[in-house]
Amino acid sequence: MMTGTIETTGNISAEKGGSIILQCHLSSTTAQVTQVNWEQQDQLLAICNADLGWHISPSFKDRVAPGPGLGLTLQSLTVNDTGEYFCIYHTYPDGTYTGRIFLEVLESSVAEHGARFQIP
């Protein structure tokens, strides 16, 4: 039975040209996290394999950085980066857990950021 839950940064906003950290945290399960994938709509941005490390898609390597932790940093944001992002936790034996984050990239210099997210 899948007992885990994913906490995410939720709905966040950031300024055009700036950067943002996407964070998810899996809790309430003893399942082994074997890999975390980060996706934007239907595109795979990055893979973090628990043993074999981070791998950033060539399409995004100039604007995506691994971490902190299992999170993902998006840089040089454009309005086209607005949309849904998903963290997909592959675990054993539970299976797959998915978290959703909505990012809005604003032209304004007064972008309000969501509450700071910290992994306990």
Epitope: N37, D51, G53, H55, P58
Partner: antibody, heavy 119, light 107 residues
Framework: QVQLQESGGELGKPGGSLRLSCAAS????????MSWVRQAPGKGLELVAT????????YYPDSVKGRFTISRDNSKNTLYLQMDSLRAEDTAVYYC????????????WGQGTLVTVSS | DIQMTQSPSTLSAFVGDTITITCKAS??????VSWYQQKPGQPPKLLIY???TRHTGVPDRFSGSGSGTDYTLTISSLQAEDVAVYYC?????????FGQGTKVDIK
């Protein structure tokens, strides 16, 4: 240049044990996760174990979970695969492999060592 | 586990031909696919990763493409030294699984 050299492959009996070794050179071994991949005679490839750079995290598919143990000694630049409760279907060439730097694919492979399980 | 099904299982073509090997995943693997070449008695050699990025030193007659569940390896102007078994591998989900292989030879 990166070099990986497996050893320890031999004839094992069903229910028995074997330990494979992979000596690594030409790179900072302690900075890389490593893997074992096997290939049964005339068959395809199967990833059977992975381990992170410091040995603190490991992964096994269901086919070998509970029977195989991957480990490493970074002071000796050596990767190991302890194979217990051997079965006939474990007969294969066993390769140690490393991903390329920034490459989502196994760019470096040893020459392999043959394990034969038979009574 | 994600199954990777390659077709055809064997392929015979003339030197200079363009050939295509297909790999179909049992679910969307979002371009997390690599391709390998294995010659008899040798370990596999990485050709392509992230579906279409050629590995260092790989001749440009080898190319990869695809998305979703369907991926292809194309060898243009097939050479005698390309005789080998070719494997795809997905990295989208653990365990990272391989296709069963496609054997390529020369007519």
């Amino acid at each position: 240049q990166v070099q990986l050299q497996e050893s320890g492959g031999e004839l094992g009996k069903p229910g028995g044990s074997l330990r494979l070794s992979c000596a690594a050179s030409g790179f900072t071994f302690s900075s890389y996760g490593m893997s074992w991949v096997r290939q049964a005679p005339g068959k395809g490839l199967e990833l059977v174990a992975t381990i992170n750079s410091n040995g603190g995290s490991t992964y096994y598919p269901d086919s070998v979970k509970g029977r195989f143990t991957i480990s490493r000694d970074n002071s000796k630049n050596t990767l190991y695969l302890q194979m217990d409760s051997l079965r006939a279907e474990d007969t294969a060439v066993y390769y140690c492999a490393r991903l390329g730097t920034g490459t989502l694919g196994f760019a470096y492979w040893g020459q392999g060592t043959l394990v034969t399980v038979s009574s | 586990d994600i199954q990777m099904t390659q077709s055809p299982s064997t392929l015979s073509a003339f030197v200079g031909d363009t050939i295509t090997i297909t790999c179909k995943a049992s679910q969307d693997v979002k371009t997390a696919v690599s391709w390998y070449q294995q010659k008899p008695g040798q370990p596999p050699k990485l050709l392509i990763y992230w579906a279409s990025t050629r590995h260092t030193g790989v001749p440009d007659r080898f190319s990869g493409s695809g998305s979703g569940t369907d991926y292809t390896l194309t060898i243009s102007s097939l050479q005698a030294e390309d005789v080998a078994v070719y494997y795809c591998q997905q990295h989208y989900s653990t365990p990272w699984t391989f296709g069963q292989g496609t054997k390529v030879d020369i007519k």
